[in-house]
């Protein structure tokens, strides 16, 4: 192309092309003319001497490039009711729906809306929300790791870490918290709490002896309510 | 608080024993308890441990060949057929992260 | 199960000395360790728990430290009380309580 701006229609050097993103080659005119922006289509084509004439896209139509479109794009249904709008229809993009909470897109079209949802699978006990989706976007359960647990049906709980025990009743396994033991009684010089870092991916948490139910989200370990009483000693 | 093993005699191989285990000063029911043993001039050895809801875990080496039992008061382990391989003092001990209640342990010879 | 491979077997120090055990697990245990003391006829004795917690009453010249795979006991200002076999200890939550112990240090003091 050469260049200088040229001005539409105009007949194109040899061995030179129409500028492909806004223009087209009329075979009929024989000359490079303009395309029509995105949110209108052609109204009439060109010829030898006048160019393209374009007209606004009506409602519930689009388009999104620029184009030589004798009509607008029909827009998508409006999206179902497990569905969310994230993107409204206009004369330049297409509406786009997706899955509300809960639901995974089990058909997507070729723009990347939803066409239909379908709810997520829920992991039982002994299992726990991976942190990567099936292809489809469906939830993947895996088995809780030793050391951790899940004892909820959920499409969001993942295995969290055994409450940790200084002094052991029952020990946790994959679909149950470990139960920790009374502390003994004779640890009861100068009071502190003891504070111990947890495995990944928990965050430090005061040691508990008792068990307390569960204040913190999901991926973090309940440690209880009740610290330790710690002789003052160093170390720990 | 004070734990103390008993039961431990001299015994001929094959025949079963059992031992025993008594803890004063805690409530015992609220405690998982473990048996660890040690072989004359040996290290330590843990066998396995009883929780509250009496399940038992044992070590893979220990499995079939021992048995942990409770009641309320005390915790019992049960050499089903000794060899001379099980001659050892058992010690009897909490489970957790912090295992300090220990006993003097009671010793098991076996031999013919 | 867990192997707990302790090294070295004995050691040798003075008194006032430092003396270094090492204890390495099979797999990782967190900070789920414990150091024990064990004299001849006696039950062995909690130090250290939680890898570098000091248990109630045991100086402070008794140091753990560690985690994953790889711990440590550090005994500084040895005495002639500190002559003993040093056992560590498996605490892993793995489903069950695993209770492995490494094979012992025997630590002289001259």
């Known amino acids: 192309v050469p260049a200088q701006v040229v001005l539409t229609p105009y007949k194109p050097e040899p061995g030179y092309e129409c500028q492909i993103s806004q223009e087209y080659y009329d075979r009929k005119a024989q000359m490079c003319c303009a395309k029509c922006p995105p949110g209108q289509y052609v109204k009439h084509f060109c010829n030898k001497t006048s160019d393209t004439v374009c007209a606004d896209c009506e409602a519930s139509m689009y388009t999104q490039v620029w184009n030589q479109f004798r009509t607008c794009l029909s827009c998508s249904s409006s999206c179902t009711t497990d569905q969310v709008e994230i993107r409204a229809c206009t004369k330049q993009q297409n509406r786009v729906c997706a899955c509300e909470a809960g639901r995974y897109c089990a058909l997507k079209t070729h723009s990347g809306s939803c066409r239909q949802c379908m709810r997520l699978s829920k992991c039982g006990p002994g299992f726990g929300v991976a942190s990567s989706r099936a292809p489809n976007g469906n939830v993947l359960c895996k088995a809780c790791a030793p050391g951790t647990f899940s004892d909820t049906t959920s499409s969001t709980d993942v295995c969290r870490p055994h409450r940790i025990c200084s002094i052991l009743a029952i020990p946790g396994n994959a679909s149950t918290d470990a139960v920790c033991a009374p502390e003994s009684p004779t640890l009861s010089a100068i009071p502190r709490t003891l504070y111990v870092s947890q495995p990944e991916p928990t965050r430090s948490q005061p040691l508990d002896q008792e068990p307390g139910p569960s204040q913190t989200p999901s991926i973090l370990t309940s440690l209880g309510s009740t610290p330790i009483i710690e002789q003052s000693t160093k170390g720990g | 608080q004070s734990v103390e093993e008993s039961g431990g005699r001299l015994v001929a191989p094959g025949t079963p024993l059992t031992l025993t285990c008594t803890v004063s000063?805690?409530?015992?029911?609220?405690?998982?308890m473990a048996w660890v043993r040690q072989a004359p001039g040996k290290g330590l050895e843990y066998i396995g441990y009883?929780?509250?809801?009496?399940s038992t875990y044992y070590a893979t080496w220990a499995k079939g060949r021992f048995t942990i039992s409770r009641t309320s008061t005390t915790v019992h382990l049960k050499i089903a057929s000794p060899t001379t391989e099980d001659t050892a003092t058992y010690f009897c001990?909490?489970?957790?992260?912090?295992?300090?209640?220990w006993g003097p342990g009671t010793l098991v010879t076996v031999s013919s | 199960d867990v192997v707990m491979t302790q090294t070295p077997a004995s050691v040798e120090a003075a008194v006032g000395g430092t003396v270094t055990i090492k204890c390495q697990a099979s797999q990782s245990i967190s900070s789920y360790l414990s150091w024990y003391q064990q004299k001849p006829g006696q039950p062995p004795k909690l130090l250290i728990y939680?890898?570098?917690t000091l248990e109630s009453g045991v100086p402070s010249r008794f140091k753990g430290s560690g985690s994953g795979t790889e711990f440590t006991l550090t005994i500084s200002d040895l005495e002639c009380a500190d002559a003993a076999t040093y056992y560590c200890q498996c605490g892993y939550y793995g489903g069950s309580y695993i209770g492995a112990f490494g094979g012992g240090t025997e630590v002289v003091v001259k």
């Open positions: 939680r890898a570098s």
């Open positions: 000063g805690i409530d015992l029911s609220r405690y998982a």
């Open positions: 001990t909490n489970v957790g992260v912090r295992m300090y209640l």
């Open positions: 009883i929780d509250t809801g009496d």
